[in-house]
Amino acid sequence: LPKAPVITTPLETVDALVEEVATFMCAVESYPQPEISWTRNKILIKLFDTRYSIRENGQLLTILSVEDSDDGIYCCTANNGVGGAVESCGALQVKMKPKITRPPINVKIIEGLKAVLPCTTMGNPKPSVSWIKGDSPLRENSRTAVLESGSLRIHNVQKEDAGQYRCVAKNSLGTAYSKVVKLEVEVFARILRAPESHNVTFGSFVTLHCTATGIPVPTITWIENGNAVSSGSIQESVKDRVIDSRLQLFITKPGLYTCIATNKHGEKFSTAKAAATVSIAEWSKPQKDNKGYCAQYRGEVCNAVLAKDALVFLNTSYADPEEAQELLVHTAWNELKVVSPLCRPAAEALLCNHVFQECSPGVVPTPIPICREYCLAVKELFCAKEWLAMEEKTHRGLYRSEMHLLSVPECSKLPSMHWDPTACARLPHLDYNKENPKTFPPMTSSKPSVDIPNLPSSSSSSFSVSPTYSMT
């Protein structure tokens, strides 16, 4: 008698390793013999697909060499025209030994930046990834973390992070090791001991001392008033990645002496500078303090730079402070038209925020000076070439007026946010986003270099020094 199909052995979940055989059985009782079709994730498996073998009148489906992509729900449907079609479904779970699909590579990184050693893996169950540094398992800490992807992220890379690394992927089916890779940490040139300024009598000898470090060890050059030192003797020594340079001078005129430490990182160079003045007694005059008031900036030149509605400090040592300070920035602004695209926005931010200083809340209007780190960033990172050229012109007396000098801060005389983060104003224009962290050049004192902070967009962008409190 005709009998509607009945599936006597329903499909079950099948576990299979990659490249192994996997079989689903769908035993059917019926008369007449049914037609059996198979689907994977509701898509019909074609009889002529060479990756599959369908036998026993369609009751056995064999995947001849399981691939990672064969994961899914497999269903058999039996129909013989008597009664309705019947269906049974089961899952194929592809198991796979760990495999490292993107192994780590050798990395050279500058101290303070973020390093990521890739280690992308495949496997089922999902492999756990750990890392070995040298011969020992790597312990995670506040700076090092194994990411979800398996990659190793090291924040604020330090010299001690240098070494040999490998990643290990492990699941219940086995373990895979990557090849050993090397993390090399390079360190920006940094001044450890800056030359000290001297006030001496005419015709005396002075020795300026400059010590720097970095990986690779930097070279030190001396600049006198913007030019290579023409007189004087230089003695150098290197020990434990520290270079020590002494410049002995016979003083017949005042001068600005700059120690420049440079080292190379690939195609790029890092530079740290420290300057000292040698003045001749009785040549300098003290500067007076003046007061001022706070008002909204109403000028034009600094409109794009200063925060909208920000209060700025106006210096009452001028008959018309707004006009005088605007003229000051206008004069200097024109000179910025010829500087590099990297330097120009940074220099404009520094100029505007230096001449039109942010006002502090309180009883009496007080200006907030720019943070030393931001000043140094402009001077030594964004505008190194231009700054040197300007100092050269100044010391050669090529500027007709001293007006422009009021718009250039002396970084060393500005407070550092390292000691008091509220003592000074940041320049948001110089801040980098978190995806592109950079560091400021090292400070010209023995303090550590400071990361460019990521400030909230709500923070003020109007800072500066009015000539009243000018640091020139």
Epitope: D289, A307, D309, A310, L311, E358, C359, S360, P361, G362, V363, V364, T366, I368, P369, K413, L414, P415, S416, W419, D420, P421, T422, A423, S458, S459, S460, S462
Partner: antibody, heavy 115, light 113 residues
Framework: EVQLVESGGGLVQPGGSLSLSCVAS????????MNWVRQAPGKGLEWLSV???????YYADSVKGRFTISRDNVKNTLYLQLNNLKPEDTALYYC?????????WGQGTQVTVSS | DIVMTQSPSSVTASAGERVTINCRSS????????????LNWYQQRLGQSPRLLIY???ARESGVPDRFSGSGSTTNFTLTISSFQPEDAAVYYC?????????FGSGTRLEIK
């Protein structure tokens, strides 16, 4: 490393005077605002005075006219002159670096006003 | 003068617990020129000098663990310790620095359960 070392505290009679000093090191003293804060035994913190980089000073009402803050940028020293002292001025006096936050604190010097 | 009011006056917590301390100022401490709130938080452990934790209401001082965070604006502010640790047992003070005199709150004593 910033170091602030207070001195000059001691036992004084009501109506008497005292001069506190704070020697600063590890930073360019002249570029930063400096403060005095005190803490009476078992009590909270009380801000007393601030002096800016141009030696302009502000005071809490409780000490105005009796206490004077000053600084010597050459000696890297902050001072607090305490006059007409009262028993309620008994406290640990801290020297603190900071403009709009009190960032670095000294260990304090004890002032006791008692007859 | 701006008066600072802190609550609660004391609180006990177990390790790993979330702790919040509130601070209210009698006037706004938000400076419209730069949109910063001039409100600071300090920690004072027994027998030690106070230590700055948070400035400008939400900026964490360098070296302060990231379990400490500050929030709020204008007159209402909160210090949160996301996962209390035994070493966090101390007295916590808020302080306004919008204009002198720069008054402190009366303090919140945080003790371990």
């Amino acid at each position: 490393e910033v170091q602030l070392v207070e001195s000059g505290g001691g036992l004084v009679q009501p109506g008497g005077s005292l001069s506190l000093s704070c020697v600063a090191s590890g930073f360019t003293f002249s570029l930063y605002y400096m403060n005095w804060v005190r803490q009476a035994p078992g009590k909270g913190l009380e801000w007393l005075s601030v002096i800016d980089t141009h030696s302009i000073a502000y005071y809490a009402d409780s000490v105005k006219g009796r206490f004077t803050i000053s600084r010597d940028n050459v000696k890297n020293t902050l001072y607090l002159q305490l006059n007409n002292l009262k028993p309620e001025d008994t406290a640990l006096y801290y020297c603190v670096l900071g403009r709009t936050a009190l960032v670095r604190w000294g260990q304090g010097t004890q002032v006791t006003v008692s007859s | 003068d701006i008066v600072m009011t802190q609550s609660p006056s004391s609180v006990t917590a177990s390790a790993g617990e979330r702790v919040t301390i509130n601070c209210r100022s009698s006037q706004s401490v938000l400076y419209s020129s730069n949109q910063k709130n001039y409100l600071n938080w300090y920690q004072q452990r027994l027998g030690q000098s106070p230590r700055l934790l948070i400035y400008w209401a939400s900026a964490r001082e360098s070296g302060v663990p990231d379990r400490f965070s500050g929030s709020g604006s204008t007159t209402n502010f909160t210090l949160t310790i996301s996962s209390f640790q035994p070493e966090d047992a101390a007295v916590y003070y808020c302080q306004q620095s919008y204009k002198p005199p720069y008054g402190f709150g009366s303090g919140t004593r945080l003790e371990i359960k």
